[in-house]
């Protein structure tokens, strides 16, 4: 970067440039310790050394040098629990949202050399250490392998794996994206004796096929088993193998609860409770019934038994079970009772304590706010996050409940730490929460700190983004407000990003940024310097984000309002908000735009086609255009099935194509990556076809070989430059 020319004090601040955003000039850092015990953790330093830290002895040393990392071009690592070996990960090759393949090398810390003989095959789809010792489980070509020690030959646990057909220990596309949100589907028992895994059989699933153009004379065809709404789904089976003598009994199948197995179903998660107790969660295809099943290993039978009296049913009568996903249980030390977040009688998601049956659950938190995540349950404390503090749904604070006390006492750990700077936290706990790290994401500059798990005392600042703070000193940042507006009986929270020299008496163009998907949240108290920050800072555009009905953490009445009728209230509430913003007096009614990506592209498209005349123009990036084109697990969760006797009518009514005529009076920019594995290019192709058939003029841009994120540097630069030109033209802003 060129050195700065000295300028005398005064208002020398400059506006953000698009280049700043595209270069990531103002990106922030977070610090998550890689915990390896109660008081020890690892962290990768700026210069790529892997450093060991002991909080109590204040000892720190390099456990793995950057030269060792560099010798195999490693970008990640994993220490074995016995601390004898480290796996080094290189040749990272992204597949879908979470999945990737890589090459793995095992480094022997004792000998100071790489383990030779029986090297791991490549590329590996997933690899992990056992929780104790140094056993390795890995997935290669859709099959699971086990090594008793890194230098040992591998034992092949599964033989059914087949590309695009049967997946063992890793999810298929739809489970990865819509159910597990992980790249793996295998879990070690706490003592490393058992390994549980899922087999996904996609043999009967229809294939989505699209061209990948590459550089060759002929394009390649990408084929993915992808169940769209109403299509055949993966068949799942859960197995557990004894890793001490895996060859004796082989994988043992875990039975599916009868009430689940009677029709199409999903596996939703697996939690080890103890070395011989496991908890599986299942979900009916119609996702309003979830069953949590606790299974025990019966030594005498050499089988996993899941008694009916250890099945706990969670059912929603107003929508779907859970939030975006069904919550997972946090078991107590007794390995029987557990804490879980689900809706209370008033429809707010709260922590409940389940000892025997769900009916007898004891509600631990309550109020017109929501418990969001249980981080850790220890002997005497439960740590969780919620949006209770001061009634702002878009905040996250960490709370501790002392469960030893009767009644349990509650303390907000984070509420008053750095109140102006920090209102949105997550946390990372050491093994028994003896220590924890807090990571604050905003609204001020992110900061990561280390704390004592008993006193909550701050021990150390791990990362405070000083460099970023310094470089932002000469930047004119916009002002950010989070407020609420009322309409009838409804309350909508919004975030408004106002240009630096904002003057209420003037008129400004307005850009609505929308996502709006079920159980999402856009109005969050987090720090960001991104494209919309630039638009406000440099181009003088007012930006607004509104959380309408269907969004999360404000109770089920608000959340489930969109159940079985997507595309209605999400749009209506954006329109309501725009009208309210106009009433505020500083919005130029002739210059209002809306943009969104993915679900936001769907909502922005429907808003533009609402026929209200509110919007002059808008952008949809990678929009869904019909719920029939999207993944079964997602579409059906919120819409039911696209069948005559279920909800086909609304599936048809809620398409963007059905509203093609209404785009006539707006400027519409439609953008999509041709290699979008998630929201297929088909969605935009169908919108374009409908607009052409209706003889409606529109603008479009495709990004060849780009996926749902349009992430390649060149594409992203082009995308944001293109959208900026479009908006500036729409708002008559000079270039």
């Amino acid at each position: 970067r060129p050195s700065r020319v000295y300028k005398p004090e005064g208002n020398t601040k400059r506006a953000l440039t698009l280049k700043d955003i595209l270069n990531g000039t103002f990106s922030y850092k977070t610090y998550f310790p890689n915990w390896i015990s109660e008081q020890e953790y690892l962290h990768q330093s700026e210069d790529d050394n892997i450093v060991f830290y002991n909080i109590e002895t204040r000892e720190s040393y390099i456990i793995l040098s950057n030269s060792t990392m560099k010798s195999v071009n490693a970008t990640d690592y994993g220490l074995s629990p016995d601390r004898q070996f480290v796996y080094l990960e290189s040749d990272y090759s992204k597949l879908w949202r979470y999945s990737y393949t890589a090459t793995y090398y095992i480094y022997d810390l004792q000998n100071g050399e790489f383990v030779r003989g029986y090297e791991l095959p490549r590329p590996i789809q997933y690899l992990c250490w056992s929780p104790v010792g140094s056993k390795l489980a890995y997935v290669y070509q859709n099959n699971i392998y086990l090594k008793q020690r890194p230098g040992d030959p591998p034992f092949q646990i599964t033989y059914t794996g087949r590309e695009n057909r049967i997946f063992n220990g890793i999810p298929d596309w739809v489970y990865e994206e819509e159910m597990l949100a992980t790249k793996y589907a295998l879990w070690w028992s706490p003592d490393g004796k058992f390994l549980a895994y899922v087999e996904f059989n996609d043999s009967d699933i229809p294939i989505i096929a699209y061209s990948y153009y590459g550089d060759g004379q002929y394009p390649r065809t990408i084929n993915i088993p992808y169940p769209k709404a109403g299509a055949k789904n993966p068949v799942v089976r859960v197995f557990i193998v004894d890793t001490t003598y895996p060859h004796h009994v082989g994988p043992m199948e875990v039975p599916v609860p009868e009430m689940i197995a009677s029709s199409d179903y999903y596996f939703s998660w697996l939690t080890w409770v103890s070395s011989e107790r496991v908890c599986l969660q299942w979900l009916k295809r119609v996702q309003n019934v979830s069953v949590l099943s606790i299974c025990d290993f019966r030594e005498d039978w050499h089988a996993w038994e899941c008694p009916k009296n250890q099945e706990h049913v969670e059912e929603s009568r107003t929508g779907w079970a859970g939030g975006f996903f069904v919550s997972t249980p946090a078991f107590s030390q007794d390995a029987t009772s557990y804490y879980k977040i689900f809706s209370d009688k008033d429809g707010y998601k709260h922590i409940h304590y389940i000892k025997d049956t769900v009916e007898n659950a004891i509600q631990i938190t309550s109020g017109k706010w929501e418990a969001i995540y249980i981080f850790r349950v220890t002997q005497d404390s439960l740590f969780y996050s919620s949006n209770e503090f001061e009634g702002y749904p878009g905040r996250r604070n960490i709370y501790r409940i002392s469960i030893g006390n009767s009644p349990p006492s509650k303390k907000c750990v984070t509420c008053h730490l750095r109140k102006e700077r920090c209102q949105y936290y997550t946390a990372s706990f050491s093994y028994k929460a003896k220590y924890y790290a807090l990571v604050c994401y905003g609204p001020g500059l992110p900061i990561s700190t280390l704390h004592d798990g008993r006193t909550d005392q701050e021990i150390q600042v791990l990362e405070e983004n000083k460099e970023l703070e310094n470089s932002l000193r000469n930047i004119q940042l916009p002002k950010v407000e989070i407020k609420k507006l009322k309409d009838g009986g409804l309350t909508f929270w919004y975030k408004m990003i106002l240009p630096p020299q904002f003057d209420r008496s003037k008129k400004y163009p307005l850009l609505i940024q929308v996502y709006g998907g079920p159980c999402s949240q856009s109005v969050k108290s987090v720090f960001a310097v991104n494209w919309i920050t630039y638009l406000a800072s440099k181009e003088g555009i007012v930006i607004a984000l509104v959380d309408g009905r269907g969004t999360a953490f404000q109770g089920d009445k608000f959340l489930h309002a969109v159940y079985r009728k997507l595309g209605v209230y999400e749009v209506e509430d954006q329109l309501t908000a725009v009208r309210k913003f106009i009433e505020m007096g500083f919005i130029d009614e002739e210059r209002i735009a809306i943009w969104g990506w993915s679900y936001g592209g769907y909502v922005s498209s429907l808003a533009l086609a609402s026929g209200t005349g509110l919007f002059k123009c808008g952008i949809a990036v990678a929009p869904v255009s019909s719920w029939e084109y999207y993944a079964s697990i997602y579409s059906e969760r919120f819409m039911g099935l696209p069948t005559k006797d279920d909800n086909l009518e609304h599936y048809k009514n809620s398409t963007v194509m059905a509203r093609a005529e209404y785009f006539r009076n707006v400027d519409y920019l439609l953008i999509h990556g041709t290699a979008d594995d998630n929201v297929h290019f088909q969605n935009s192709a169908q919108i374009a076809k409908a607009l052409v058939n209706a003889q409606v003029d529109f603008q479009a841009m495709w990004y060849s070989d780009q996926n749902h994120g349009i992430l390649s540097g060149r594409s992203q630069n082009h995308l944001y430059t293109h959208m900026t030109h479009f908006l500036k033209q729409c708002f008559s802003l000079s270039d």
């Epitope: 060859h247 009994v249 994988p251």
Partner: antibody, heavy 117, light 108 residues
């Protein structure tokens, strides 16, 4: 007490078929993978085939692949081996054994299959 | 497939003597996957040792197993009259599971 009892052996012509059964008792049959191991007269032991506890996965030695089919009926606690296109080299005592790829902790007494014209 | 080679083919010993049987694998076998069996004429094999060194239920402690990688040993510390039989090693690491050709322990 664990017991495995094979039956169905006998004399068969080359190209013929035979179905062996193994009745199991004394343990939770459906929880265990089961195998067939054979022993040609005066020779060593050869693993032939295995099946998972649920019956969903089957495994074969190359020498019998495509000709032999292993199956089980967990409701009857019985293991089967359907042998088609039999050859002289399939002549052996066939044992059913408890386990997948070993260790085979329990064995039946064996049933003799003779393939001869 | 993994080939197991047992030696010697025959071992002639007297009761009370120590017997040492060897099993060599064509490629490394983690000790977890190696077992030893005893077979007497007209009888089914009987599991003696699993995991290279763990005795199966009811097996007298004169039988012991050791080894790792490619070399494994079955030791009978003091031969009893009922110990004269054929002994097989077996690996369960790979499909197909394979057995050694056997070592016959006969009375000298």
């Amino acid at each position: 007490e664990v017991q495995l009892l094979e039956s169905g052996g006998g004399l068969v012509q080359p190209g013929g078929s035979l179905r062996l059964s193994c009745a199991a008792s004394g343990f939770t049959f459906s929880s265990y993978a089961m195998s067939w191991v054979r022993q040609a007269p005066g020779k060593g032991l050869e693993w032939v085939s295995a099946i998972s506890g649920s019956g969903g996965s089957t495994y074969y030695a190359d020498s019998v692949k495509g000709r032999f089919t292993i199956s089980r009926d967990n409701s009857k606690n019985t293991l089967y081996l359907q042998m088609n296109s039999l050859r002289a080299e399939d002549t052996a005592v066939y044992y059913c054994a408890k386990g997948w790829l070993g260790p085979f902790d329990y064995w039946g007494q064996g049933t003799l299959v003779t393939v001869s014209s | 497939e993994i080939v197991l080679t047992q030696s010697p083919g025959t071992l002639s010993l007297s009761p009370g003597e120590r017997a040492t049987l060897s099993c060599r694998a064509s490629q490394s076998v983690s000790s977890s996957y190696l077992a030893w069996y005893q077979q007497k004429p007209g009888q089914a094999p009987r599991l003696l040792i699993y995991g290279a060194s763990s005795r199966a239920t009811g097996i007298p402690d004169r039988f012991s197993g050791s080894g790792s990688g490619t070399d494994f040993t079955l030791t009978i510390s003091r031969l009893e009259p009922e110990d004269f039989a054929v002994y097989y090693c077996q690996q369960g690491l790979n499909i197909p599971s394979t057995f050694g050709q056997g070592t016959k322990v006969e009375i000298k």
